[in-house]
C-alpha cells in the first residue's frame, strides 16, 4: 500500500439508540440490504470472471450482544468502508447507512486492511460480498422461523 494511504479510519465510538431493534426492524433492514448485496456480488462475479469461490476473509456475521439473531453491524461495516473505493460506491454507501442502524453500543468497530496483492485483494472483496450475502440469508431465515 502506498504511504499516502496509511490513514487509520477506525475505532470511533458510536452512541447506539437507547431502544433495542425489534425483529421487524431487523427484517426490514435485511430486506433492504439483500438486493444490494446480491447486485454487488453478481456485478463483481461478472467483472472478475474465473475467480474461485473464496474463503479468504472470515466476515463476522452474528452479534453476540443480542438475544435475537442480529447482524453484527459494528464488525461488518468496516469491511464495506474498506472495499468502497474498489467497488460501486453508491451501493456501498446505501449498505453503510443500513449497517449503521444495526450497530450496538458495546461493539467497537474493527480495523480492516486491504490486501496489497492484486489476486488476494480480489479474493478478499469476493469473500466479503459472498459471506455478507450468506449472512443476510442466514439471519433472515432465523427471523422468519422465530417468533414474529
Amino acid at each position: 500500500m502506498r504511504g499516502s494511504h496509511h490513514h487509520h479510519h477506525h475505532g470511533s465510538s458510536h452512541m447506539a439508540p437507547a431502544h433495542r431493534l425489534q425483529p421487524s426492524d431487523i427484517r426490514k433492514i435485511i430486506l433492504e440490504l439483500r438486493p444490494m448485496s446480491k447486485g454487488l456480488l453478481q456485478d463483481y462475479l461478472k467483472k472478475e470472471i474465473g475467480l474461485p469461490e473464496s474463503n479468504h476473509s472470515s466476515l463476522p456475521c452474528l452479534s453476540s450482544d443480542s438475544q435475537l439473531p442480529h447482524i453484527n453491524g459494528s464488525a461488518i461495516l468496516p469491511y464495506f468502508r474498506a472495499i468502497r473505493p474498489l467497488s460501486d460506491k453508491n451501493t456501498i454507501d446505501k449498505i453503510i447507512e443500513q449497517l449503521d442502524k444495526l450497530k450496538f453500543q458495546r461493539e467497537p468497530e474493527a480495523k480492516v486492511s486491504m490486501p496489497a496483492d492484486n489476486f488476494e485483494r480480489k479474493n478478499f472483496i469476493l469473500a466479503v460480498l459472498q459471506q455478507f450475502s450468506a449472512c443476510l440469508e442466514h439471519v433472515l431465515q432465523s427471523l422468519n422461523s422465530g417468533p414474529q
Epitope: 500500500m1 494511504h5 479510519h9 461495516l77
Partner: antibody
Framework: QVQLQQSGAELVKPGASVKLSCKAS????????INWVRQRPEQGLEWIGW????????KYNETFKGKATLTTDKSSSTAYMQLSRLTSEDSAVYFC??????????????WGQGTSVTVSS | DIVLTQSPASLAVSLGQRATISCRAS??????????MHWYQQKPGQPPKLLIY???NLESGIPARFSGSGSRTDFTLTINPVETDDVATYYC?????????FGAGTKLELK
C-alpha cells in the same frame, strides 16, 4: 439526500482569522472524509486538506500548513476550517466536499455551495 | 506532487457534436488495479459536480452522454452529443496520492 451546507460570506481584515463551517446531513458523518478546496477568482481548484471525523485524523497540502486548521464536531455533524493570518492572497471561495470512507482516497461526490472570503482593509 | 495537465484549455464544439478533453498525469494514478482519476463539471457561481469517478464510472444522476476512459497516466472525458447545458469548465482530479491535485480546467463553449 446528502447535503453540505456552508456558512455565509465573510469580509475580514488582513492579519485576522476566520472560521468557516460545513454542516453535513443525509449520511453518517463520521464515516466519510471531509475535504476543503480553495478557488481563487477566475482560477482553478486547489486542495487544502482532509479531515476524517471518525478519529479526527487530518492531512494538509503543504501549501496550507500553518494557514488552515481543520476540525469537526461529530455531535452536530459539522466540519470547520480556520484560516489564520489572512492576506489578500487568501481571498477566494472555499468549498467543503465529501470524500471516501477508507484509507484509500476517493472522489469528492458531494460539495457545499462554497463560502466567499474577502480579505480587505 | 502529481501534476495533471489538461488539454485543450478551451474548446468550442457545435451542438450535437462530440467533445473530448484529455488529462495527463505526471505519474501513474493507478493503485489496487483501479485508476483514481475523477472528472468534475463546474458552472459559474456553482460548486463542482462529480461526473465520472475512478476513470470510467458514471456518477449517479449524470447523463450517459458523459463517459470517461484511460488508465495510469492518460485519461479522457468524452461528451457525446454535446448539449447547451454542458457549457462549463471541466476538471480532472487524482486521489491516488496526497496531496490531491486538480487539472487547470478545460472551458467548454458552443460554436
Amino acid at each position: 439526500q446528502v447535503q453540505l451546507q456552508q456558512s455565509g460570506a465573510e469580509l475580514v481584515k488582513p492579519g485576522a482569522s476566520v472560521k468557516l463551517s460545513c454542516k453535513a446531513s443525509g449520511y453518517t458523518f463520521k464515516y466519510y472524509d471531509i475535504n476543503w478546496v480553495r478557488q481563487r477568482p477566475e482560477q482553478g481548484l486547489e486542495w487544502i486538506g482532509w479531515i476524517f471525523p471518525g478519529d479526527g485524523g487530518t492531512k494538509y497540502n503543504e501549501t496550507f500548513k500553518g494557514k488552515a486548521t481543520l476540525t469537526t464536531d461529530k455531535s452536530s455533524s459539522t466540519a470547520y476550517m480556520q484560516l489564520s493570518r489572512l492576506t489578500s492572497e487568501d481571498s477566494a471561495v472555499y468549498f467543503c466536499a465529501r470524500g471516501g470512507t477508507s484509507v484509500i482516497r476517493d472522489a469528492m461526490d458531494y460539495w457545499g455551495q462554497g463560502t466567499s472570503v474577502t480579505v480587505s482593509s | 506532487d502529481i501534476v495533471l495537465t489538461q488539454s485543450p484549455a478551451s474548446l468550442a464544439v457545435s451542438l450535437g457534436q462530440r467533445a473530448t478533453i484529455s488529462c495527463r498525469a505526471s505519474e501513474s494514478v493507478d493503485n489496487y488495479g483501479i485508476s483514481f482519476m475523477h472528472w468534475y463539471q463546474q458552472k459559474p457561481g456553482q460548486p463542482p459536480k462529480l461526473l465520472i469517478y475512478r476513470a470510467s464510472n458514471l456518477e449517479s444522476g449524470i447523463p450517459a452522454r458523459f463517459s470517461g476512459s484511460g488508465s495510469r497516466t492518460d485519461f479522457t472525458l468524452t461528451i457525446n452529443p454535446v448539449e447547451t447545458d454542458d457549457v462549463a469548465t471541466y476538471y480532472c482530479q487524482q486521489s491516488n496520492k496526497d496531496p490531491l491535485t486538480f487539472g487547470a480546467g478545460t472551458k467548454l463553449e458552443l460554436k
